[in-house]
Structures are given as C-alpha cells and as structure tokens.
C-alpha cells in the first residue's frame, strides 16, 4: 500500500464576503484510519476549522457524505464568509490514537482571499459654516473592504476636484481595510445649491462606484448686502423707510430698527423670497413719524445674521 | 475518555418487552454511528442493530432474527443509544454491548461492559 | 449472510512461539481494494477488544506483535511471540455488507 497522501489541489480561493466558501481536500487512502481535521494557519496557533470526528461546526459542511463507504473527499463549505476568514487553510489527517489522535499529514494549504465591498462613503463637513471665497475641507470615509487596492474621487457638482488626500488603512497586511479622504473645497455665493460628492471604486462593486454626498447649504453662510431707503410720504407727518436685505443664507435673521441709536423694533425673518441661487431676499420697513422730531433723524437698520456679529446700514432722515 | 454505560437488563418472560439503554461520554456522540452487538454461548457473538447519524436521517439496519421486533433509537442531546425489545424471545438470551462504530464500517473500536438479558418463563 | 468460519476452533501455543488463526469468508469482503475485516481480542468477563482494522492494519494502542494479512475470502491473524496475557478468544468480524457477522472464535492457551 502506498502511503496516504493528502491533497489540495487549489492554491488559492477567492470568496464574496456573505458567500460560501468550498475548500477541496482529498486522501488517497482510508489507511491509517484516522479523523481529517481542518485548520487556519499552521503552528501551534493554528486554529480548528472542522474536525470529522469531535465537536460541532455549525458554519461547515462537507460536501460529500463521510459516512458513506470508501469515502476519500473530505471538502468542505464554509458559509457567510466574512473579511474576517481570510487566511490559509490546512487539511490535516490525523492517525487514530490512544488516547490522542496523532497528526499524521498535511495538505499544502489553500489560501482564502475574502473579497468585501466597502461600505457606504460617509462625507462630513466642517462643524461651522463659512462664507465664501474661504476654503473648508471635507472628509469621506469607508470601511470594510477587501482586498486593498481602492479609488476614490471627489466631485462638486459634476466637476472632479484635485485638491485632496487620501490614506488606506492599515498600511500592511489585514483582512479588511478602510480609506479616509480629505478634500479642500473653495466657496463661492453660488455654492447654496452645491453638492460635495466622494465615490468609491473597487473591485467588488462592478463598475459601480459608491458614492456618499454632503449638500453645502448645511456648510455655507452667506452674509446679506443691506439697502436703506427712504419712501416718498405716504401720509401727513408720516415717512415709510425701507431696508432691503439681500442674498443672504441661511434663513435665521433678526432686524433691529433703530431711531438715533434708540431701539424702535425688532423683528424675525419670517416670509422671506427665495432666490434662484437659494440665498433669500427680505425686506423690512418703518413707518416715521415726522411731527414727533425737531432734527434730523438717523435710522439705522441692523441684521444679526445667523448669530454673527451685527451688520448695519443707516439712513438720515431730513425734517425740514 | 470514552466510556460506554449499558443498563436496562434483567430477566423478562417470552412475549414481554424491555428497553436497553446506553449512555456514552468522553466524546462526540453525534459524530459515531451505535450499535448493539450481542453475545451468547449458543450463538457466539452477534450484531443485533446499528443507528447511524442524523446527517444520514438516524438510519437505522438489523438482524434479521431481530427485525420488526426490536427498535434501535438515539437522542443525540443525551448520548444516549437505546434498544427497545418486544416480543422477546429464549434466544434473545445474552450479553448485550452497546458499541461505538469509528469509521463508518463496523469499526466496533469501543465496547460498553455489557448488560445481561435472560428471557424464560 | 456471510459466514465467517474461524480454525482451529481452540489452540495451545509455547510462549514466546507464534500463533496462527485463520478466518475463511462466504463470499469476499473486498471492495475497491480494501479488505473489510476486523480482528478481536476478548478475555473472560470482559466485552471484545479491536486488535485490527480492514484486515492489516493495527489499531491503536496494540501491541506490534499481533499481525493481520489477507484478501477477498481467506484471512490470517498472527501473534508472534506469544505472551502470557494473550490468553484469550479471537474473533473475526466483517463489514463488508449488512449484516456484520462474527466468527465463531478461536480459544489461544499459553503453554
């Protein structure tokens, strides 16, 4: 009788994360009689996949029956594959011993790659808003994926961007993998409506990139321009002033009238006009008793714009 | 260490029924195929029935002598092997031994001590 | 059925000498090359001991001096040189279809 031999004929397997793994072992003897047991890695720890004989592997199957007779295949399948079982996988026959069984050969091992698909680009922006013409930087993250290689890219409205780093983690070997990006983005008055995209390509997702966005309405602030403006006399002694605040975002504004530097209303933005670009137009007035002053009178019109400093605008009324 | 417990035996009348039971430790009950082997001055040593495992849905095979009278059964959770007998007979008379079969084969490579059945009036 | 028939039925052999048990089958017990005989050891008061597997091959734990050869119908076991405690009945068993049949038994004295 030759002696047993065990053999793996695949060097390598390569398995969807969520999918079955089949790693093939045969012998080519029953003799010595003796349990097959499966491991990952080799050396002293090493660790148990599937023994025939003891114990209980609810992810492994065999692929043929064990019990039937002259049965040399002792395959198996192991199910929902994550990132996590990549490693080499030895077939071990172990000859039947008192009170230990004793190993008696290896099979050259199969080494299992795990493919993972990235998850969803998570892009997060600063934690305060910032008005235009300043650079804000942007992060997208993913995780998860297998094996290493991986693109990503970065867009605002359609155009690819160019300012931006990129680090995959960790840098040796792992069995999944993340990717952290940052992205220098310019403002502009324009950008209310802008979207900030990140997209992920890999090997696992088909030409079908993931992409992950940040809309930079939630980033942008953009101050008003004020117009005070004096109406024609609307009725006897009384004088309508007008202030015009313009292209201004986001919504959240308080209008401080105020006649010589003394309060005389204050007021919340309430149905403001939405511009084109998706920055807001509003106006406030105030209706000046003339009779009630002796002097000129000097309006000023003050907006607290989504609680930055104050900006004002004045207008000296002539009481003639 | 494996270890094979018989228990159940004593002296029945012919006709009347009894159950063998076998409990088994120091190892994957599961995994092994059971038998009852018997064994008898007269008759030397004869296989009575083999369960084999759920994975084979508890197949179960039997002498001929001993086919539609005795019932071999297992309950993986408790380790347990169990032969139910009706219907006995004097020739049923004997050593009963509960056995692990290693390999699938009749590979008897572990014995209980045994169990004495005597059946007479 | 297959029938296992053992010679001698009972053998006395000098220590230290070697003993020969023979086990002729019905109708062979051979099947894509392996030879599904097994071999047994049992001394009084205690349950059968497996001494050899598919005809040849020592099962563990059993001393080398016990042997097993053979193919198809005719079987051998050997032991050489006998030992005191091998005093016992042998018995042959096959599985090489159902039902599993035993030998009748060969009784080996040390003498």
């Known amino acids: 009788e030759e002696e047993l031999q065990v053999i793996q004929p695949d060097k390598s397997v390569l398995v969807a994360a969520g999918e079955t793994a089949t790693l093939r072992c045969t012998a080519t003897s029953l003799i010595p009689v003796g349990p097959i047991q499966w491991f990952r890695g080799a050396g002293p720890g090493r660790e148990l996949i599937y023994n025939q004989k003891e114990g209980h592997f609810p992810r492994v199957t065999t692929v043929s029956d064990l019990t039937k007779r002259n049965n040399m295949d002792f395959s198996i399948r192991i199910g929902n594959i994550t990132p996590a079982d990549a490693g080499t996988y030895y077939c071990v026959k172990f000859r039947k011993g008192s009170p230990d069984d004793v190993e008696f050969k290896s099979g050259a091992g199969t080494e299992l790659s795990v493919r993972a698909k990235p998850s969803a680009p998570v892009v997060s922006g600063p934690a305060a808003r910032a008005t235009p013409q300043h650079t804000v930087s942007f992060t997208c993250e993913s995780h998860g994926f297998s094996p290493r290689d991986i693109t990503l890219k970065w867009f605002k409205n359609g155009n690819e961007l160019s300012d931006f780093q990129t680090n995959v983690d960790p840098v040796g070997e792992s069995v999944s993998y993340s990717i952290h990006s940052t992205a220098k983005v310019v403002l502009t008055r324009e950008d209310v409506h802008s979207q900030v995209i990140c997209e992920v390509a890999h090997v696992t997702l088909q030409g079908d990139p993931l992409r992950g966005t940040a809309n930079l309405s939630e980033t942008i602030r953009v101050p008003p321009t004020l117009e005070v403006t004096q109406q024609p006399v609307r009725a006897e002694n009384q004088v309508n002033v007008t202030c015009q605040v313009r292209k201004f975002y986001p919504q959240r504004l308080q209008l401080t009238w105020l006649e010589n530097g003394n309060v005389s209303r204050t007021e919340t933005a309430s149905t403001v006009t939405e511009n084109k670009d998706g920055t807001y137009n509003w106006m406030s007035w105030l209706l000046v008793n003339v009779s009630a002053h002796r002097d000129d009178v000097k309006l000023t019109c003050q907006v607290e714009h989504d609680g930055q400093p104050a900006v004002s605008k004045s207008h000296d009324l002539k009481v003639s | 260490e494996v270890k094979l417990e018989e228990s159940g035996g004593g002296l029945m009348q012919p006709g009347g029924s009894m159950k063998l039971s076998c409990v088994a430790s120091?190892?994957?009950?599961?995994?092994?195929?059971m038998n009852w082997v018997r064994q008898s001055p007269e008759k030397g040593l004869e296989w009575v029935a083999e369960i084999r495992l759920k994975s084979n849905n508890y197949a179960t095979h039997y002498a001929e002598s001993v086919k539609g009278r005795f019932t071999i059964s297992r309950d993986d959770s408790k380790s347990s092997v169990y032969l139910q007998m009706n219907n006995l007979r004097a020739e049923d008379t004997g050593i009963y031994y509960c056995i692990r079969d290693y390999d699938y084969d009749a590979y008897f490579d572990y014995w209980g001590q045994g169990t004495t059945l005597t059946v007479s009036s | 059925d297959i029938v296992l028939t053992q010679s001698p039925a009972s053998l006395a052999v000098s220590l230290g000498q070697r003993a020969t048990i023979s086990c002729r089958a019905s109708k062979s017990v051979s099947t894509s090359g392996y030879n599904y005989m097994y071999w047994y050891q049992q001394k009084p008061g205690q349950p059968p001991k497996l001494l050899i597997y598919?005809?040849?091959n020592l099962e563990s734990g059993v001393p080398a001096r016990f042997s097993g050869s053979g193919s198809g119908t005719d079987f051998t076991l050997n032991i050489h040189p006998v030992e005191e405690e091998d005093a016992a009945t042998y018995y042959c068993?096959?599985?090489?279809?159902?039902?599993?049949?035993f030998g009748g038994g060969t009784k080996l004295e040390i003498k």
């Open positions: 068993q096959h599985s090489g279809e159902l039902p599993y049949t």
């Open positions: 120091g190892f994957t009950f599961s995994n092994y195929w």
């Open positions: 598919l005809a040849s």
